[in-house]
Each structure stands twice: as structure tokens, then as C-alpha cells.
Interface confidence: low
């Protein structure tokens, strides 16, 4: 014989009272009305539990708040349940027992019938934990109940000096859902905000929590699943100013059931969005999109941004959204990479896509573009990477696909393949009016359109030309002449630190920029258009450097410690960090600065040429880096602009040196013996290569490396051709994450930033 083991099961919930009304006195815990009503409601609730078989397990309970509707009582209670019954008393079962009692006629004189007319329909029971009750009790010193009327925007004030933590209990009309907006007003803060899909801070009903001040989402909107929400705000550092503005409103439920018929074309045809995008999707989100495809020749491609889908093994819940596509279950997850889900169309009745939030924890709204692709040739001239659904260049010497299959089975890697005998010739020898292949196939079709491929240049009219790197070479290769447009770039001025470098002369590198904070040079950059400077994203990783207002950009500068007539300065109006930039891996290390006014070009200030996506910078080619960085590892910066020539290194060779940390968005340059390299202070500066036309093209941006000039460790640069689509998008006003822009980062221990 031994004592029965019991387990304390905690429940939280609410009940609706039809014969009483909420008053503002009941919102103030210190009022007499609150205390009186709590005592009576507490007794009533105890009676209700006691009159069911739950009574024998009753431990304790508390009515902790009231709300409108006519009167809603919010409570928690604890039952001590025998362990063997633990699973049988779920919140659903407990609710059934209590509702059963409310509907029965067994105890007509009970106070839940006489004094309180409790509505059985309005009873809510949720699973909770002891910890939830502890958190709830810790916030009751600053407990604020608010009813959010339709059309009202309710501003929530932060905790005051006396309290470090406050809880808002928010309620709106039952047919609407609550939406909280959080807008950051400061760069640095240590506050914590947690939002719950329940009347109290129940861990299992957490929607999202935010710590510190995010630069990635200057405004964040969060939806509840319905009309009840709890927000806990914990102060970090005391300040007289709230680091963010917090407001809430009631909004209508938005339907996301869509039927679409696609047209027989291959460009993006529209997008699917979760309700109130870009708001966080609600815990109750269920979207169903049905797309009809015009023919079985097409497949459907879904293009995601910083979000991807994967199979979830063992049927675990999806924590960032569940997708059902053609009865296939996939889980969404946030990622700093592009992704496309390709859906083969195998039946004429179209495709159904369902998106569901499976747990209360949600995330940023999801937007997915849709387009068709040709099932027989999904990636004309390119390779379909099955891992992420993207079309990537094949056989160009860079493993774009995570499994490397785009570089497998290549007859000629990063070279031209002669049709006659499959011999390989270097790309600059193609269309150079000099036959190199046996029957001269390298010089055929040089004046006409060809199928698009890895090394073909795409003209504005979307036709492709065979000649490699035809941009701005003084010869119109495209029918529409678009290869010779926007060519006011890449020319040096009339005149003829960096480790192992030499001093530059005025006007030699007229695109070079110096990015400064309070008169101190921090990073290099390059002018690419009359209002745009490109640099490295990691220059802005520190919170203290994240605001565009802090920066001054100098162009035409030669010496750091003196001004001269040829230099001009600009403030930064907007800062765009690449949305996929990841500090730990240095991937997508690129940022764009919009200058506060246009640049007037001169002999000492003019832009470098941006390469096309297909531009080929040949490994072995000698290019140049420039900057005011240190001239030796750990040394001071250089006062005069330095230049040094470096050799472009094959990707696989560099990847071996860096143990496969070099991504396709990176390019390596330097020498096996070291000595010539970029260093601290050169970050974001240009790596430029000269084309036969005499024009300089931007191949890379100084990003990272192990030390400076060390043997066997090359300099690593952002590969501009792999981010040029994003650059063009931002320049034409179509995207990027503007006005701010990085994630919270951690420093990578093994690398010194240049």
C-alpha cells in the first residue's frame, strides 16, 4: 500500500456572466469594487467546480481580472489529479464537465445560477502551468485591462519608474481580431515584449516575443487569433522615453480563400499573402489557394523570400507554418536564402495550396509570388537546383546549388565548349574575331541572338548574345543596343591601406568612397550611380553604426587627414542592407547607401561599371583593390589611398583554404604566398577588374579574410555578379530592406574583418 501520486494540473480561462455589467472600477485591482466582486466571483467559481466530480481534486483558484461582455471573469485554478487520470482531464474534458453542470438542474440554488447567470457557451478553459501563474502574478502590480472598440487605436504606455513589468489584458469585439503594432523609436534598448493569444501570459499561447530593438523590422504588427490578447512589457534599462510605440486595434477577419486561373506565360503573375501582410500571421490562419494552370505543359513555381519549405519527419508540428500542396505536407521555416517550391502539374484540375498556423507561435507574414515554368525545360540554359528550386548557372566553376550538382558532369567548366570536338577554350576568346575551335564554332552566331545560358548576356528585350562581357565595350551587340546603355562608368581620371600596396594618384580610382562617422574613416565603398554608393553590410553591424543619419560619405578623396578641392561629401538618406546578409557566415555582405543629393561627375568623381549577372571574371585575372585600411595586420590605417593588384582565385581552391565556408556570393583574390591583401578599414571597398575596352568593372567588395596578407589565406570579397539583381532592384526602387536593416548579429570568432 502506498499513497496515491497526484499531479498539480493548472488551467486558465474565462466565463461570461449575463446578468452583470463591467464597470471601469473593475479594471482597477486596487478598487473596492474589484475586491468585492472578486470575493463573490471566487466563491461562485469554487461552488461550480465543487458541484462536479472535479471537486475532489480542487486545490486553489483565483479570479484575477474582469472584462466586458457584459461581464467576463478571468480565472486560473489548480486541480490535484491522480497521475493515472492526468491525460483524461484535458481542458476540453474539464470544460465539458463544467458546462454539463451549468446546463443541469441539479443545484438550483447555487450562486452560479442565482447571483451570477453564467453562460455555458461562453466558458473558455485553457491548459496552463505553474510558471504561467508565477508570471501572471509578477505582472499584477502593473495590470492594465483595455477594451479595444472598433475603429479605435489604443496606445499602450510602457512601464513607469516604479514597475519593471506590465501586463496588458486586451479585449475587443468577439467578431474581430486584435492587431498590435510595435514601432521602434530608438536604436538601443533592452526591453522585452511578449504577446500571447490568451487573456494571460500562457507560455503555450505565446505568439511572439521581442528582445532589444530590431533594425530589421522598424515596424512590426502582430495578429491574435481572435478578440483576446495579453501583452507583457518588461523594461530593460530605465529611460524617460519608451524605446517603442505600442498600439492595438480591432480589425476584421480577412478571408484568404482564393481561386485563380493563371495565364500561359512564364513571368511572375501575382502573389499570395497571409491576411494583413506584412503583419505577423495570426495563430488561427488558414489559407486555401486554388490555382488553375492552363496546360499540363506547365508546372507551378512558388517564389519565397527568406522563407523555405521542407518535409517534417515524424509528423511533428510545423512551428513556422504548415503547407499542404497537392496533399503533400511541408513545413515552412525562415531562412536567409531565396527559395522556390516547384509543383509539377500532373492533373488538369489545378493545384490547391493550404497554409495553416499549427501553433500559437507565429512569425512575419508570408508572401509568395507565383509563376509558371515549362515542365520540359524549367531552367532554359541553366541548371535546376533541386534543393531550393532555383535556376542557377551551370558549369561556371561556382557551386551555386548546395549539393554541388550544377558543377557535376561538366565537359568544360567556366570555359566555352567547342561544338566540333568538345574541346574547351577560355571565354574571352569567344567572338573575338579569331577562330579557336576546329571549325570556328566559337566565332559563329556572334551577331545574332542565341539561346540564353550561363555566360550569355541578356539584352533588355530578353534576347541573349553569345559574346561574353559585351557591356560597354563600344560595340552594340544587342539588337536593341542595350549592352551599350548606362555606360558613363568605369573610366579613370586623366592621371595615370592595402597590404603590400602603393599610393594612388588623384582621379585614378574616381569611384572610391570613404564612409565616415564623426570624421573617422570606418569603411570603403564605391560609387555606382549618381545617388548610390555600394559597400559591405558588415560595416553596419554594430548597433551604434546602424542609423543612416550617422554616416558621411566622401568621394574624390585622396588623403584622410586633409581636405582638398576635388573631394565632395554627402549625408546618407537611406541605408539598404541585403535582406539575406548573415553576419556569422559573411554571406550576402553588401549594402547600398542612398546619398542625400545627386553627385556631379568630374575627373575625380565618377562611377565604376556594374557587371551583368552573366559577367565572367576569369580566375587568374589580375584586378585591383583600393582603400585606406591598415598596411599590415593590426596596424594603423593609411592616410593616403592605397592600391594593390590581386589575382582572382578559383572558387574550389579558395574553399579548400577556408574549409568550405566560401559561399557562391563570395569571390577570392590574392596570392598563395599572401603579402598583397585588403585589411581592416578596407571593408566595403571595391575590387575592380579592367576589361579590354579600358573600362573598370566592379567584381567584388572587401568582405573578410583570416588576418591580412597571410600565406594560403586569400582575401574574400562579396561577388557582385551574384547580388547585382538585388542592386538593380534597389536602384530602381523595387526592394531591399530600407531605412535600417540588419539582424542582431554575433561576432564570428575566427575571422578578422577587413
Amino acid at each position: 500500500y502506498k499513497a496515491e501520486v497526484t499531479i498539480s494540473q493548472v488551467y486558465s480561462g474565462s466565463l461570461r456572466v449575463l446578468n452583470r455589467h463591467f464597470s471601469q472600477d473593475l479594471a482597477r485591482r486596487e478598487s473596492i469594487a474589484f475586491r468585492t466582486e472578486t470575493a463573490k466571483a471566487q466563491k461562485m467559481f469554487q461552488e461550480l467546480v465543487a458541484s462536479t466530480r472535479l471537486g475532489t481534486y480542487y486545490n486553489s483558484s483565483s479570479i484575477y481580472a474582469f472584462g466586458e461582455g457584459p461581464l467576463i471573469c478571468f480565472f486560473w485554478f489548480i486541480l490535484d489529479i491522480p497521475e493515472y487520470q492526468r491525460l483524461t482531464l484535458s481542458p476540453e474534458v474539464v470544460r465539458e464537465l463544467l458546462v454539463g453542470e451549468l446546463l443541469s438542474n441539479s443545484s438550483a440554488l447555487a450562486s452560479y445560477r442565482t447571483e451570477y447567470e453564467v453562460d455555458p457557451e461562453g466558458l473558455v478553459i485553457l491548459e496552463a502551468s505553474v510558471n504561467d501563474i508565477v508570471v501572471l502574478n509578477s505582472t499584477l502590480g502593473c495590470y492594465r485591462y483595455s477594451y479595444v472598440n472598433p475603429g479605435q487605436v489604443l496606445r499602450l504606455r510602457g512601464p513607469d519608474q516604479q514597475t519593471t513589468s506590465c501586463l496588458w489584458h486586451l479585449q475587443g469585439p468577439e467578431d474581430l481580431m486584435l492587431k498590435v503594432q510595435l514601432e521602434w523609436t530608438r536604436v538601443d534598448c533592452r526591453d522585452r515584449v511578449a504577446m500571447y493569444d490568451a487573456a494571460g501570459p500562457l507560455e503555450k499561447r505565446l505568439i511572439t516575443s521581442v528582445y532589444g530593438c530590431s533594425r530589421q523590422e522598424p515596424v512590426m504588427e502582430v495578429l491574435a487569433s481572435g478578440s483576446v490578447m495579453a501583452v507583457v512589457w518588461k523594461k530593460g534599462l530605465h529611460s524617460f522615453y519608451d524605446p517603442f510605440l505600442l498600439s492595438v486595434k480591432s480589425v476584421a477577419f480577412q478571408d484568404c480563400q482564393v481561386n485563380l486561373t493563371l495565364e500561359g506565360r512564364l513571368d511572375p503573375q501575382g502573389f499570395l499573402r497571409t491576411p494583413y501582410y506584412p503583419s505577423y500571421y495570426s495563430p488561427s490562419t488558414h489559407c486555401s489557394w486554388h490555382l488553375t494552370v492552363p496546360s499540363l505543359d506547365y508546372g507551378l513555381a512558388l517564389w519565397f523570400d527568406a522563407y523555405a519549405l521542407r518535409r517534417q519527419k515524424y509528423n511533428l508540428l510545423c512551428t513556422q507554418g504548415q503547407w499542404m500542396i497537392q496533399n503533400r505536407r511541408l513545413c515552412g521555416f525562415r531562412t536567409l536564402q531565396p527559395y522556390a517550391e516547384r509543383i509539377p502539374v500532373v492533373a488538369s484540375d489545378g493545384i490547391t495550396i493550404n497554409f495553416t498556423s499549427q501553433i500559437s507561435l507565429t512569425g512575419p507574414g508570408v508572401q509568395v509570388y507565383y509563376s509558371l515554368y515549362n515542365q520540359s525545360d524549367p531552367c532554359p540554359g541553366e541548371f535546376l537546383c533541386s534543393v531550393n528550386g532555383l535556376c542557377v548557372p551551370a558549369c561556371d566553376g561556382i557551386k551555386d546549388c548546395p549539393n554541388g550538382l550544377d558543377e557535376r558532369n561538366c565537359v568544360c567548366r567556366a570555359m566555352f565548349q567547342c561544338q566540333e570536338d568538345s574541346t574547351c577554350i577560355s571565354l574571352p576568346r569567344v567572338c573575338d574575331r579569331q577562330p579557336d575551335c576546329l571549325n570556328g564554332s566559337d566565332e559563329e552566331q556572334c551577331q545574332e541572338g542565341v539561346p540564353c545560358g550561363t555566360f550569355t548576356f541578356q539584352c533588355e528585350d530578353r534576347s541573349c548574345v553569345k559574346k561574353p562581357n559585351p557591356e560597354c565595350d563600344g560595340q552594340a551587340d544587342c539588337r536593341d543596343g542595350s549592352d551599350e546603355e548606362h555606360c558613363d562608368c568605369g573610366l579613370q581620371g586623366p592621371s595615370s591601406r592595402i597590404v603590400g600596396g602603393a599610393m594612388s594618384s588623384e582621379g585614378e580610382w574616381p569611384w572610391q568612397a570613404s564612409l565616415q562617422i564623426r570624421g573617422r574613416h570606418i569603411c570603403g565603398g564605391a560609387l555606382i550611380a549618381d545617388r548610390w554608393v555600394i559597400t559591405a553590410a558588415h560595416c553596419f553591424q554594430e548597433d551604434s553604426m546602424a542609423s543612416p543619419r550617422l554616416w558621411t560619405v566622401f568621394l574624390g578623396k585622396m588623403r584622410q587627414n586633409s581636405r582638398w578641392p576635388g573631394e565632395v561629401s554627402f549625408k546618407v538618406s537611406r541605408l539598404f542592407l541585403h535582406p539575406y546578409h548573415e553576419e556569422d557566415s559573411h554571406d550576402y555582405d553588401v549594402a547600398l547607401l542612398q546619398l542625400d543629393h545627386p553627385v556631379v561627375y568630374s575627373a575625380t568623381v565618377r562611377p565604376v561599371c556594374l557587371p551583368a549577372r552573366s559577367h565572367f571574371f576569369e580566375p587568374g585575372q589580375h584586378c585591383w583593390i583600393t582603400g585606406w585600411g591598415a598596411q599590415r595586420e593590426g596596424g594603423p590605417g593609411s592616410s593616403t589611398l592605397q592600391k594593390v593588384d590581386v589575382q582572382l582565385i578559383p572558387q574550389d581552391l579558395c574553399n579548400e583554404a577556408y574549409r568550405y565556408q566560401v559561399t557562391p556570393r563570395m569571390l577570392c583574390a590574392g596570392y598563395r604566398k599572401g603579402k598583397k591583401d585588403a585589411c581592416q578599414g578596407d571593408s566595403g571597398g571595391p575590387l575592380v577588374c579592367k576589361e579590354p575596352s579600358g573600362r573598370w568593372f566592379l567584381a567584388g567588395l572587401v568582405s573578410w579574410g583570416l588576418g591580412c596578407g597571410r600565406p594560403n589565406f586569400f582575401g574574400v570579397y562579396t561577388r557582385v555578379t551574384r547580388v547585382v539583381n538585388w542592386i538593380q532592384q534597389v536602384l530602381t526602387g523595387g526592394g531591399g530592406s530600407g531605412g535600417g536593416g540588419s539582424h542582431h548579429h554575433h561576432h564570428h570568432g575566427s575571422h578578422h574583418h577587413h
Partner: antibody, heavy 124, light 111 residues
Framework: EVQLVESGGGLVQPGRSLRLSCAAS????????MYWVRQGPGKGLEWVSG????????GYADAVKGRFTISRDNAKNVLYLQMNSLRPEDTALYYC?????????????????WGQGTTVTVSS | QSALTQPPSASGSPGQSVTISCTGT?????????VSWYQQHPDKAPKVMIY???KRPSGVPDRFSGSKSGNTASLTVSGLQAEDEADYYC??????????FGGGTKLTVLG
């Protein structure tokens, strides 16, 4: 090397049971749909059954439904076919086959790797 | 589910082309693009030659091609060679997690 090796075949009387196994090696077993296909003496190929990577989707040919059970043990990289209430017409060479790598984890219903088969004879 | 219909035999001389048909219904071949073709030499396991109507796995010569029209799929072997002599089976997904094979066609290379 990608390999499938069937075992468990033999002579069995009508109405009795037999369990076939297929040991997989050289590939990630739990990434693939697996199938059983049989071929009667002098006859054509006949699809018997298929099972998804996580066993949540299973299909059977009408001729074996209710009598045969397909299962898999991803930890051991083994596919099974439990055959009950065997009939003379179940006599065949039983092949285990692997679904082609689906680029997006889609089923293409195409078998790109086959074993050498195990013979089942049902006779009194 | 009933088997797909294939001609029992087909033949051609070396260098010629031969086409084998595979007829199903609007619920299998006609509805889905999941038609495959397998080659089987005597006492050997089958080998996939075509999948998804017309796709060729790597290593399969481009002399083998597949197509589909309505409820009928076809396998064409051009530039016939002696080693092409074998049994050929078509298969299709038939819905409800079922696959169906054809009865098989014996391809003979004459001469």
C-alpha cells in the same frame, strides 16, 4: 554502391504466410518511397505495393489488398512484405524497388533501382 | 485496376526506328504525366528508360524517347541496335496510391 537485396522467399503451401525482406544500402533509405513488384513465371511485371518514406501513405494492388502488408524500418534500412493467405497465383519472383530521387520530394512513381528478386512458390 | 495494353511484340532491323504503344484510360495514362518505360533483358531486373512521359535518366541513350497523346503513351527506339532486344514494360500512376504496369512488349531486332 546503391543496392537492394531481397530475401525470405521459398516454397509455401496455399493459405500459409511468408515475410519478405529487402535490405537497402548505399543511399539514404528514409528519403525514398519503396515498392514491391512481382513477375509470375513467363509473365509480365505486376505492381504489388508501395510505401512512403515515413509509412504514412501506403498503396496495394487490388489482387493483394487485405492479404499483404508492406512496412519499413528506417533505422535498419529494411523494407518488408508480410504475405498472408497465400494463393497459387501469388507464385512469382518478387522484386524490391526504389522510387527515383524526387527533385522536390515528389513521387514520380518510377523505380530507378531494383533488387535481383526473391522467388516465392505457392503450391501444395 | 486493369493492366495497360501493350502489343505483345514489335520488331525492326538494326538502324531502323520502332514505336511501342501503351494504352490506358483517362484515369491513369490520360490523367497523369507519370508514365514510365522499363527495359528487361532475360533473367535480369528491369531498368528504367523513360519517366514522366518523356524524361530520360542519365546513362540512357538518346535513341530512346517517350511521348503521350490522350490515353496512349509511346516509346520510340530509333537507330535500333542488337542490345535493344528485350522486353519493354510501360507503367503509369493510376491514382489512390496505385501503380499499374502494361502487359509487356517483346522487341526483336531482326537480322
Amino acid at each position: 554502391e546503391v543496392q537492394l537485396v531481397e530475401s525470405g522467399g521459398g516454397l509455401v503451401q496455399p493459405g500459409r504466410s511468408l515475410r519478405l525482406s529487402c535490405a537497402a544500402s548505399g543511399f539514404t533509405f528514409d528519403d525514398h518511397v519503396m515498392y514491391w513488384v512481382r513477375q509470375g513465371p513467363g509473365k509480365g511485371l505486376e505492381w504489388v505495393s508501395g510505401i512512403s518514406w515515413n509509412s504514412d501513405t501506403i498503396g496495394y494492388a487490388d489482387a493483394v489488398k487485405g492479404r499483404f502488408t508492406i512496412s519499413r524500418d528506417n533505422a535498419k534500412n529494411v523494407l518488408y512484405l508480410q504475405m498472408n493467405s497465400l494463393r497459387p497465383e501469388d507464385t512469382a519472383l518478387y522484386y524490391c524497388a526504389r522510387e527515383k530521387d524526387g527533385d522536390f520530394y515528389y513521387n514520380y512513381f518510377v523505380m530507378d533501382v531494383w533488387g535481383q528478386g526473391t522467388t516465392v512458390t505457392v503450391s501444395s | 485496376q486493369s493492366a495497360l495494353t501493350q502489343p505483345p511484340s514489335a520488331s525492326g532491323s538494326p538502324g531502323q526506328s520502332v514505336t511501342i504503344s501503351c494504352t490506358g484510360t483517362s484515369s491513369d495514362v490520360g490523367f497523369y504525366n507519370f508514365v514510365s518505360w522499363y527495359q528487361q533483358h532475360p533473367d535480369k531486373a528491369p531498368k528504367v528508360m523513360i519517366y514522366e512521359v518523356s524524361k530520360r535518366p542519365s546513362g540512357v541513350p538518346d535513341r530512346f524517347s517517350g511521348s503521350k497523346s490522350g490515353n496512349t503513351a509511346s516509346l520510340t527506339v530509333s537507330g535500333l541496335q542488337a542490345e535493344d532486344e528485350a522486353d519493354y514494360y510501360c507503367s503509369s500512376y493510376a491514382g489512390s496510391n496505385k501503380v499499374v504496369f502494361g502487359g509487356g512488349t517483346k522487341l526483336t531486332v531482326l537480322g
